[in-house]
Amino acid sequence: EGAAQSNNSLMLQTSKENHTLASNSLCMDEKQITQNHSKVLAEVNISWPVQMARNAVLCCPPIEFRNLIVITWEIILRGQPSCTKSYRKETNETKETNCTDERITWVSTPDQNSDLQIHPVAITHDGYYRCIMATPDGNFHRGYHLQVLVTPEVTLFESRNRTAVCKAVAGKPAAQISWIPAGDCAPTEQEYWGNGTVTVKSTCHWEGHNVSTVTCHVSHLTGNKSLYIELLPVPGAKKSAKLY
């Protein structure tokens, strides 16, 4: 079997839709937020895809510190009790309830910075994060639906004569697989793992003698990757002119 050769093409470099992936933080100055994320101020909840192993910074609503009474971060992770981290300005006290993950911390001391950081992001950090700013004028809050993205490992091999198997292993969410050229493909198989990742497998056959090399293209929110492989000869074939 010939080894597949690889072609990495990060979607971050080519896709405007995925600009949030390139940044670890949505905490920009208000002018930037208004320009780049006009919905952010108006929305209470933000869906935010974050790549695993990167660092993420989540920010509170833009409230002046002098107006603050209490800052509370509420963290709801799947299968765990709700964790709260709070800071009372008047007493300069911080308090935590049911918070066991040491990777989720204040960026610095809450009187300096109310942002929350996840360092680094793990697959278990999928969940809902909400900052509540209590002021004399009422409560202001901003919520994040954090979707942790896991880059799949892509493999390509020829399983038997002119049949290739492309796998996108343990991706989150599931990757999509396409082929150049299109082949005679079995239905795509998906295998779901307990940690929320998915392995996608595509198996295709090329009868055409003139197909020299097949390319498996894997599309994923974390980036695209292509692998290609030269197919073995048609069994029994020795010599041919240009064949169609």
Partner: antibody, heavy 114, light 107 residues
């Protein structure tokens, strides 16, 4: 690292044959197609055909059909390209390449002149 | 056969300028390709494999993009040593076919 070492330059008369060799190292010789490409002076690149050493399977471009023969010797990890009935327009540099075109030999100049 | 239409056939550009070369596959047939640089008397050198993968040791000013039938090769800031002829090669179908080449001169 794949290495492809080609035989030296040849001068041939019209009507004669030439056999160019390409010795491979650094990869599993029988598992990769070997291709031949030529380039006439001042011209572009032209694919001639390929051979799969593991089975001896061959594809020739129809332009060279009947005049070209590609063979492989697995004991020495060498492929050969023989071109017969040479004419002046066959004067070119002949390249062998493998690993889906990512590894090339340095080329062999074949001059056909009376 | 898949014909690869490469354009332009030649261009003369100043150092520091951006250079773009395109290759289009005939018959609307999706393919995969490589981009090569060739200097006089030398074998072609692979710069970009599989449409967009920069080969080891190749300066980052070179890039490739595109998929399906339309592909682009770019030099972001031309250097004097980039004077050469550039070729695309489709390797999806037999026969493999090259573009006609683009001769790049420095003004």
């Amino acid at each position: 690292q794949v290495q492809l070492v080609q035989s030296g330059a040849e001068v041939k008369k019209p009507g004669a044959s030439v056999k160019v060799s390409c010795k491979a190292s650094g990869h599993t010789f029988t598992s990769y197609w070997m291709h031949w490409v030529r380039q006439a002076p001042g011209q572009g690149l032209e694919w001639m055909g390929n051979i799969y050493p593991g089975s001896g399977s061959i594809n020739y471009d129809e332009k060279f059909q009947g005049r070209v023969t590609m063979t492989a010797d697995t004991s020495t990890s060498t492929v050969y390209m023989e071109l017969s009935s040479l004419r002046s327009e066959d004067t070119a540099v002949y390249y062998c390449l493998t690993m889906t075109g990512t590894s090339w030999g340095r080329g062999t100049l074949v001059t056909v002149s009376s | 056969d898949i014909q690869m239409t490469q354009s332009p056939s030649s261009l003369s550009v100043s150092v520091g300028d951006r250079v773009t070369i395109t290759c289009q596959a005939s018959q609307g047939t999706p393919i995969n390709l490589h981009w090569f640089q060739q200097k006089p008397g030398k074998a072609p050198k692979l710069l970009i494999s599989g449409a967009s993968n920069l080969e080891d040791g190749v300066p980052s000013r070179f890039s490739g993009s595109g998929s399906g039938t339309e592909f682009t090769f770019t030099i972001s800031s031309l250097q004097p040593e980039d004077a050469a002829t550039y070729y695309c090669l489709q390797f999806t179908y037999i026969p493999w076919t090259f573009g006609q080449g683009t001769k790049l001169e420095i003004k």
